[in-house]
Amino acid sequence: SQPQAVPPYASENQTCRDQEKEYYEPQHRICCSRCPPGTYVSAKCSRIRDTVCATCAENSYNEHWNYLTICQLCRPCDPVMGLEEIAPCTSKRKTQCRCQPGMFCAAWALECTHCELLSDCPPGTEAELKDEVGKGNNHCVPCKAGHFQNTSSPSARCQPHTRCENQGLVEAAPGTAQSDTTCKNPLEPLPPEMSGTMLM
């Protein structure tokens, strides 16, 4: 079988065998090696010499196999825009950012550029849980039956109503979507405003 050509090698049809790791150089009509992630082209290829790569300097990176003559500058996450760093920049990957807790991404340009505060969910509702953090503003949904939530908050969850009998007490007032059950000692009389509702 034919030995596989090693870059640089001639290419008549302007395509290279390994599209990820090689590129077509039109001046010499050859296929040359790309530089691996974390490196850049320090010397271009010729008919007799393959690409020479060098490591990206500190605070710069290249994420992919490339034939770039420079590395990209690392950019910090912009905390003024509500972003926080979740992984620092390395020679092979740019800084990874996301919105801080309590914020959502309000502006995208290939990646999130600006986060804003999540809106509050009013009493009787809670924020619908999303799979991914920081991806959208709160969508408030009513507490399900038997649950309540009594604050205006972006993060408060509906809680189950207290079961008075579990505490050896009796119900004085039923819970609502916005308030918990009121319990009382079984020996205490009902407050005057509720005495009319008692079955004798």
């Epitope: 905390p79 926080e84 760093e85 979740i86 801080q100 807790p101 914020m103 505060l117 953090v133 993060s155």
Partner: antibody
């Protein structure tokens, strides 16, 4: 160098309260969310909650209504007010930088016992 | 909440051994996983973030791999100072969760 220094722990009776502090240096504190984590004796790590740069808070269910996180960005200080303490709250309490908890303080010990 | 299951819970090994600790998430967490080392009486120290990126100053004998739900911490050649407890932690969710820990002891 990022440094976090917790203080305010101690021995407290069940039902009692403490205010834990975390003094931050070496980074722009006001820009970062901050996290509290605790570790009961001989046990694993438990996330307590996170506070964002503007003071918005998220808590784990077991401490909701009893613990309150706050911060003073002008003093580069984070606080955890712990109320209605129970025996099971006995632990070393750590503050950590960012919601990812990338750098931790040395911890402060809270012992709840009668 | 996302559950993190770490195994083994304890491990005896000798200096020079290659050691592997695994961590499984109850749902996909992309590469939002850190590994921490904790020595008795000390705070946890982050060794690895984003599943495989080494913190600066951490020896290259430590490595991490995995994505999605299954992750691995490997120590290629154990040194005396590596005997400690190791924890995985997910940060895909703001409510961080930790594995139960792996206590690495001298055989």
């Amino acid at each position: 160098e990022v440094q976090l220094l917790e203080s305010g722990g101690g021995l407290v009776q069940p039902g009692g309260s403490l205010r834990l502090s975390c003094a931050a240096s070496g980074f722009t504190f006001s820009y970062y969310a901050m996290t509290w984590v605790r570790q009961a004796p001989g046990k694993g790590l438990e996330w307590i909650g996170v506070i964002n740069s503007g003071g918005g808070t998220y808590y784990t269910d077991s401490v909701k209504g009893r613990f309150t996180m706050s911060r003073d960005n002008s003093k580069n200080t984070l606080y955890l007010q712990v109320n209605s303490l129970r025996a099971e709250d006995t632990a070393v309490y750590y503050c950590a930088k960012a919601s990812t908890a990338d750098v931790w303080g040395q911890g402060t010990t809270v012992t709840v016992s009668s | 909440d996302i559950q993190m299951t770490q195994s083994p819970s304890s491990l005896s090994a000798s200096v020079g051994d290659r050691v592997t600790i695994t961590c499984q998430a109850s749902q996909g967490i992309s590469n939002y996983l850190s590994w921490y080392q904790q020595k008795p009486g000390k705070a946890p120290k982050r060794l690895i973030f984003a599943a495989s990126s080494l913190e600066s100053g951490v020896p290259s004998r430590f490595s991490g791999s995995g994505s999605g739900t299954d992750f691995t911490l490997t120590i290629s050649s154990l040194q005396p100072e590596d005997f400690a407890t190791y924890y995985c932690q997910q940060y895909n969710s703001y409510s961080l969760t930790f594995g139960g820990g792996t206590k690495l002891e001298i055989k």
